[in-house]
Protein backbone atom coordinates (compact mmCIF):
# COMPACT_ATOMS: atom_id res chain seq x y z
CA UNK A 1 0.00 0.00 0.00
CA UNK A 2 3.05 2.26 0.04
CA UNK A 3 4.17 4.60 2.76
CA UNK A 4 1.44 6.45 4.63
CA UNK A 5 2.02 9.98 5.86
CA UNK A 6 -0.25 12.32 7.76
CA UNK A 7 -0.67 15.91 6.68
CA UNK A 8 0.28 18.26 9.49
CA UNK A 9 -3.04 20.07 9.25
CA UNK A 10 -5.77 19.48 11.79
CA UNK A 11 -8.81 21.53 12.62
CA UNK A 12 -8.91 20.20 16.17
CA UNK A 13 -12.34 18.90 15.30
CA UNK A 14 -12.58 15.81 17.48
CA UNK A 15 -9.87 16.69 19.96
CA UNK A 16 -10.29 17.26 23.65
CA UNK A 17 -7.62 19.93 23.38
CA UNK A 18 -8.47 22.23 20.45
CA UNK A 19 -4.96 23.67 20.40
CA UNK A 20 -3.20 20.50 19.31
CA UNK A 21 -3.57 17.63 16.90
CA UNK A 22 -5.59 14.81 18.44
CA UNK A 23 -3.53 12.10 16.74
CA UNK A 24 0.20 11.78 16.36
CA UNK A 25 1.27 13.16 13.01
CA UNK A 26 3.44 10.15 12.23
CA UNK A 27 0.96 7.37 12.96
CA UNK A 28 -1.91 6.09 10.91
CA UNK A 29 -4.91 4.03 11.95
CA UNK A 30 -5.57 0.97 9.81
CA UNK A 31 -9.21 0.57 10.87
CA UNK A 32 -11.86 0.90 8.17
CA UNK A 33 -14.07 3.95 8.17
CA UNK A 34 -11.30 6.35 9.16
CA UNK A 35 -10.71 7.54 5.61
CA UNK A 36 -12.83 8.80 2.76
CA UNK A 37 -12.23 10.07 -0.76
CA UNK A 38 -10.20 13.26 -0.75
CA UNK A 39 -12.13 16.39 -1.68
CA UNK A 40 -11.54 17.37 -5.29
CA UNK A 41 -9.65 20.48 -4.22
CA UNK A 42 -6.80 18.24 -3.01
CA UNK A 43 -6.42 16.48 -6.36
CA UNK A 44 -2.83 17.67 -6.72
CA UNK A 45 -1.89 17.60 -3.03
CA UNK A 46 -0.02 14.28 -3.12
CA UNK A 47 2.86 14.52 -5.57
CA UNK A 48 4.01 10.90 -5.72
CA UNK A 49 1.17 9.06 -4.08
CA UNK A 50 -2.56 9.01 -3.58
CA UNK A 51 -4.69 11.19 -1.35
CA UNK A 52 -7.14 10.07 1.29
CA UNK A 53 -9.12 12.12 3.76
CA UNK A 54 -8.75 11.58 7.50
CA UNK A 55 -12.37 11.59 8.66
CA UNK A 56 -11.63 12.41 12.31
CA UNK A 57 -9.58 15.47 11.36
CA UNK A 58 -11.17 16.46 8.04
CA UNK A 59 -7.74 16.80 6.52
CA UNK A 60 -5.87 15.22 3.59
CA UNK A 61 -3.27 12.51 4.02
CA UNK A 62 -0.97 10.95 1.45
CA UNK A 63 -0.19 7.30 0.81
CA UNK A 64 3.15 7.48 -0.95
CA UNK A 65 4.29 5.46 -3.90
CA UNK A 66 7.19 3.15 -3.13
CA UNK A 67 10.43 5.08 -2.84
CA UNK A 68 8.83 8.39 -1.82
CA UNK A 69 8.32 10.03 1.56
CA UNK A 70 7.15 13.34 3.02
CA UNK A 71 3.78 14.82 3.91
CA UNK A 72 3.06 15.25 0.21
CA UNK A 73 5.24 12.33 -0.99
CA UNK A 74 7.51 15.01 -2.38
CA UNK A 75 10.89 13.52 -1.40
CA UNK A 76 12.79 10.55 -2.71
CA UNK A 77 13.50 8.02 0.03
CA UNK A 78 17.28 7.75 -0.07
CA UNK A 79 17.14 4.54 1.96
CA UNK A 80 14.67 2.81 -0.34
Amino acid sequence: DGNSTRSPETNGLLCGDPEENCAATTTQSKRKGHFSRCPKQYKHYCIKGRCRFVVAEQTPSCVCDEGYIGARCERVDLFY
Epitope: E9, G12, Q58
Partner: antibody, heavy 116, light 106 residues
Framework: QVQLLESGGGLVQPGGSLRLSCAAS????????ISWVRQAPGKGLEWVSY????????NYADSVKGRFTISRDNSKNTLYLQMNSLRAEDTAVYYC?????????WGQGTLVTVSS | DIQMTQSPSSLSASVGDRVTITCRAS??????LGWYQQKPGKAPKLLIY???SLQSGVPSRFSGSGSGTDFTLTISSLQPEDFATYYC????????FGQGTKVEIK
Protein backbone atom coordinates in the same frame (compact mmCIF):
# COMPACT_ATOMS: atom_id res chain seq x y z
CA GLN B 1 -5.93 30.07 23.86
CA VAL B 2 -5.94 30.17 20.08
CA GLN B 3 -5.65 33.72 18.73
CA LEU B 4 -5.42 35.13 15.22
CA LEU B 5 -4.82 38.85 14.84
CA GLU B 6 -5.05 40.52 11.43
CA SER B 7 -3.47 43.84 10.55
CA GLY B 8 -2.56 45.93 7.53
CA GLY B 9 -5.98 46.96 6.32
CA GLY B 10 -6.85 50.48 5.28
CA LEU B 11 -7.90 52.75 2.44
CA VAL B 12 -6.22 52.22 -0.93
CA GLN B 13 -6.90 53.53 -4.43
CA PRO B 14 -8.01 51.24 -7.26
CA GLY B 15 -4.97 49.62 -8.83
CA GLY B 16 -3.02 49.95 -5.59
CA SER B 17 -1.44 47.35 -3.33
CA LEU B 18 -1.74 46.32 0.29
CA ARG B 19 -0.17 43.62 2.43
CA LEU B 20 -2.17 42.01 5.20
CA SER B 21 -0.64 40.11 8.11
CA CYS B 22 -2.09 37.60 10.55
CA ALA B 23 -0.21 36.90 13.78
CA ALA B 24 -1.05 33.53 15.34
CA SER B 25 -0.62 32.36 18.91
CA UNK B 26 -1.90 29.67 21.26
CA UNK B 27 -1.28 26.74 18.93
CA UNK B 28 1.54 25.17 16.92
CA UNK B 29 1.25 27.39 13.86
CA UNK B 30 3.66 25.34 11.73
CA UNK B 31 1.34 22.31 11.87
CA UNK B 32 -1.78 23.99 10.51
CA UNK B 33 -3.14 25.12 7.19
CA ILE B 34 -4.39 28.71 7.26
CA SER B 35 -6.86 30.56 5.03
CA TRP B 36 -8.02 34.05 4.19
CA VAL B 37 -11.79 34.61 4.00
CA ARG B 38 -13.38 37.97 3.22
CA GLN B 39 -16.76 39.60 3.69
CA ALA B 40 -17.89 42.65 1.75
CA PRO B 41 -19.96 45.15 3.77
CA GLY B 42 -23.43 43.73 4.34
CA LYS B 43 -22.65 40.68 2.22
CA GLY B 44 -21.81 37.02 2.72
CA LEU B 45 -18.56 35.13 3.23
CA GLU B 46 -16.11 34.47 0.40
CA TRP B 47 -13.10 32.18 0.72
CA VAL B 48 -10.01 33.85 -0.78
CA SER B 49 -7.02 31.53 -0.41
CA TYR B 50 -5.34 28.87 1.70
CA UNK B 51 -1.81 27.69 2.30
CA UNK B 52 -0.69 24.38 3.72
CA UNK B 53 1.51 24.03 6.80
CA UNK B 54 4.78 24.09 4.87
CA UNK B 55 3.78 26.76 2.36
CA UNK B 56 4.06 24.40 -0.63
CA UNK B 57 0.39 23.83 -1.46
CA UNK B 58 -1.68 26.91 -2.23
CA ASN B 59 -5.04 27.64 -3.83
CA TYR B 60 -6.92 30.83 -4.68
CA ALA B 61 -10.46 31.81 -5.53
CA ASP B 62 -10.84 32.69 -9.20
CA SER B 63 -11.77 36.26 -8.25
CA VAL B 64 -8.28 36.97 -6.86
CA LYS B 65 -6.06 34.60 -8.86
CA GLY B 66 -3.08 36.40 -10.38
CA ARG B 67 -3.54 39.45 -8.15
CA PHE B 68 -3.23 38.10 -4.60
CA THR B 69 -0.39 36.06 -3.11
CA ILE B 70 -0.61 34.14 0.14
CA SER B 71 2.53 33.26 2.11
CA ARG B 72 3.61 32.38 5.62
CA ASP B 73 6.62 32.61 7.90
CA ASN B 74 6.49 29.73 10.37
CA SER B 75 9.43 31.15 12.32
CA LYS B 76 7.32 34.24 13.04
CA ASN B 77 3.95 32.48 13.36
CA THR B 78 2.62 34.87 10.74
CA LEU B 79 0.46 34.58 7.64
CA TYR B 80 0.49 37.18 4.85
CA LEU B 81 -1.71 38.24 1.96
CA GLN B 82 -0.13 40.46 -0.69
CA MET B 83 -2.90 42.17 -2.63
CA ASN B 84 -2.07 43.87 -5.93
CA SER B 85 -4.19 45.51 -8.65
CA LEU B 86 -6.92 46.14 -6.12
CA ARG B 87 -10.47 46.78 -7.32
CA ALA B 88 -13.53 48.34 -5.70
CA GLU B 89 -15.05 44.86 -5.39
CA ASP B 90 -12.14 43.80 -3.15
CA THR B 91 -13.51 46.09 -0.43
CA ALA B 92 -14.23 43.82 2.52
CA VAL B 93 -13.31 42.71 6.00
CA TYR B 94 -10.51 40.17 5.60
CA TYR B 95 -10.34 37.35 8.13
CA CYS B 96 -7.58 34.84 8.61
CA UNK B 97 -8.91 31.49 9.75
CA UNK B 98 -7.29 28.26 10.86
CA UNK B 99 -7.77 25.37 8.45
CA UNK B 100 -7.87 24.68 4.74
CA UNK B 101 -11.19 22.88 4.34
CA UNK B 102 -12.97 24.05 7.48
CA UNK B 103 -12.29 27.04 9.67
CA UNK B 104 -12.42 26.39 13.39
CA UNK B 105 -10.77 29.61 14.64
CA TRP B 106 -11.05 33.08 13.13
CA GLY B 107 -9.43 36.44 13.71
CA GLN B 108 -11.44 39.60 14.30
CA GLY B 109 -10.81 40.80 10.74
CA THR B 110 -9.22 43.85 9.14
CA LEU B 111 -11.10 46.22 6.84
CA VAL B 112 -9.77 46.91 3.35
CA THR B 113 -11.44 49.77 1.47
CA VAL B 114 -10.64 50.27 -2.21
CA SER B 115 -11.84 53.68 -3.32
CA SER B 116 -10.66 56.77 -5.13
CA ASP C 1 -17.41 26.10 -9.45
CA ILE C 2 -19.93 24.64 -7.04
CA GLN C 3 -22.75 27.02 -6.10
CA MET C 4 -24.39 26.78 -2.68
CA THR C 5 -27.99 27.97 -2.36
CA GLN C 6 -29.49 28.50 1.08
CA SER C 7 -33.17 28.84 1.87
CA PRO C 8 -34.82 30.78 3.22
CA SER C 9 -32.69 33.92 3.00
CA SER C 10 -34.29 35.10 6.23
CA LEU C 11 -36.82 33.84 8.74
CA SER C 12 -38.58 35.07 11.85
CA ALA C 13 -38.94 32.76 14.82
CA SER C 14 -39.58 32.78 18.55
CA VAL C 15 -37.57 31.41 21.43
CA GLY C 16 -38.31 27.69 21.75
CA ASP C 17 -39.17 27.24 18.07
CA ARG C 18 -37.68 24.49 15.94
CA VAL C 19 -35.82 26.10 13.05
CA THR C 20 -34.67 24.42 9.84
CA ILE C 21 -32.35 25.92 7.24
CA THR C 22 -31.60 24.15 3.97
CA CYS C 23 -28.58 24.29 1.70
CA ARG C 24 -28.40 22.89 -1.81
CA ALA C 25 -25.20 22.27 -3.77
CA SER C 26 -25.15 22.64 -7.55
CA UNK C 27 -23.42 19.24 -7.75
CA UNK C 28 -22.78 16.36 -5.38
CA UNK C 29 -20.32 17.08 -2.55
CA UNK C 30 -20.74 13.80 -0.60
CA UNK C 31 -20.71 15.08 3.01
CA UNK C 32 -18.11 17.83 2.62
CA LEU C 33 -20.23 20.52 4.20
CA GLY C 34 -19.92 22.81 7.21
CA TRP C 35 -22.29 25.22 8.95
CA TYR C 36 -21.29 28.51 10.59
CA GLN C 37 -23.03 31.04 12.80
CA GLN C 38 -22.19 34.74 12.57
CA LYS C 39 -23.40 37.57 14.78
CA PRO C 40 -23.16 41.25 13.72
CA GLY C 41 -19.64 42.62 13.95
CA LYS C 42 -18.19 39.23 14.90
CA ALA C 43 -16.27 36.50 13.13
CA PRO C 44 -18.12 33.34 12.10
CA LYS C 45 -18.18 30.32 14.40
CA LEU C 46 -18.01 26.71 13.17
CA LEU C 47 -21.03 24.69 14.29
CA ILE C 48 -21.16 21.54 12.16
CA TYR C 49 -18.61 19.77 9.97
CA UNK C 50 -18.85 16.76 7.65
CA UNK C 51 -22.57 17.58 7.26
CA UNK C 52 -23.62 16.13 10.60
CA SER C 53 -20.75 16.20 13.12
CA LEU C 54 -21.08 18.69 15.98
CA GLN C 55 -18.04 20.86 16.57
CA SER C 56 -16.61 20.68 20.08
CA GLY C 57 -18.32 23.09 22.48
CA VAL C 58 -21.40 23.65 20.32
CA PRO C 59 -24.77 23.02 22.05
CA SER C 60 -26.54 19.79 21.13
CA ARG C 61 -29.66 21.70 20.00
CA PHE C 62 -27.76 22.25 16.74
CA SER C 63 -27.74 19.34 14.31
CA GLY C 64 -26.95 18.79 10.67
CA SER C 65 -28.06 16.22 8.13
CA GLY C 66 -27.89 15.41 4.44
CA SER C 67 -25.46 14.21 1.81
CA GLY C 68 -24.93 14.63 -1.90
CA THR C 69 -26.64 17.88 -2.82
CA ASP C 70 -29.22 18.56 -0.09
CA PHE C 71 -28.35 19.51 3.48
CA THR C 72 -30.17 20.78 6.54
CA LEU C 73 -29.24 22.65 9.71
CA THR C 74 -31.75 22.27 12.52
CA ILE C 75 -31.98 24.18 15.79
CA SER C 76 -34.27 22.05 17.95
CA SER C 77 -35.27 24.78 20.40
CA LEU C 78 -34.22 28.30 19.49
CA GLN C 79 -32.48 30.23 22.26
CA PRO C 80 -32.03 34.03 22.53
CA GLU C 81 -28.34 33.74 21.65
CA ASP C 82 -29.16 31.86 18.42
CA PHE C 83 -30.50 34.91 16.58
CA ALA C 84 -27.77 35.35 13.96
CA THR C 85 -26.89 34.66 10.33
CA TYR C 86 -26.06 31.08 9.34
CA TYR C 87 -23.87 30.02 6.42
CA CYS C 88 -23.25 26.65 4.80
CA UNK C 89 -19.89 25.96 3.17
CA UNK C 90 -18.84 23.18 0.82
CA UNK C 91 -15.25 21.98 0.77
CA UNK C 92 -15.23 19.33 -1.93
CA UNK C 93 -14.18 21.61 -4.75
CA UNK C 94 -12.57 24.92 -3.78
CA UNK C 95 -14.37 26.31 -0.74
CA UNK C 96 -17.62 28.18 -1.36
CA PHE C 97 -20.24 29.53 1.03
CA GLY C 98 -23.97 29.87 0.74
CA GLN C 99 -25.43 33.38 0.73
CA GLY C 100 -26.56 33.13 4.35
CA THR C 101 -29.82 32.82 6.28
CA LYS C 102 -30.69 35.50 8.81
CA VAL C 103 -32.66 34.25 11.81
CA GLU C 104 -34.58 37.13 13.36
CA ILE C 105 -36.84 37.53 16.39
CA LYS C 106 -40.54 37.28 15.58
Amino acid sequence: QVQLLESGGGLVQPGGSLRLSCAASGFTFSRYWISWVRQAPGKGLEWVSYIDSTGTFINYADSVKGRFTISRDNSKNTLYLQMNSLRAEDTAVYYCARGGSLFDYWGQGTLVTVSS
Amino acid sequence: DIQMTQSPSSLSASVGDRVTITCRASQGIISYLGWYQQKPGKAPKLLIYAASSLQSGVPSRFSGSGSGTDFTLTISSLQPEDFATYYCQQYDALNTFGQGTKVEIK
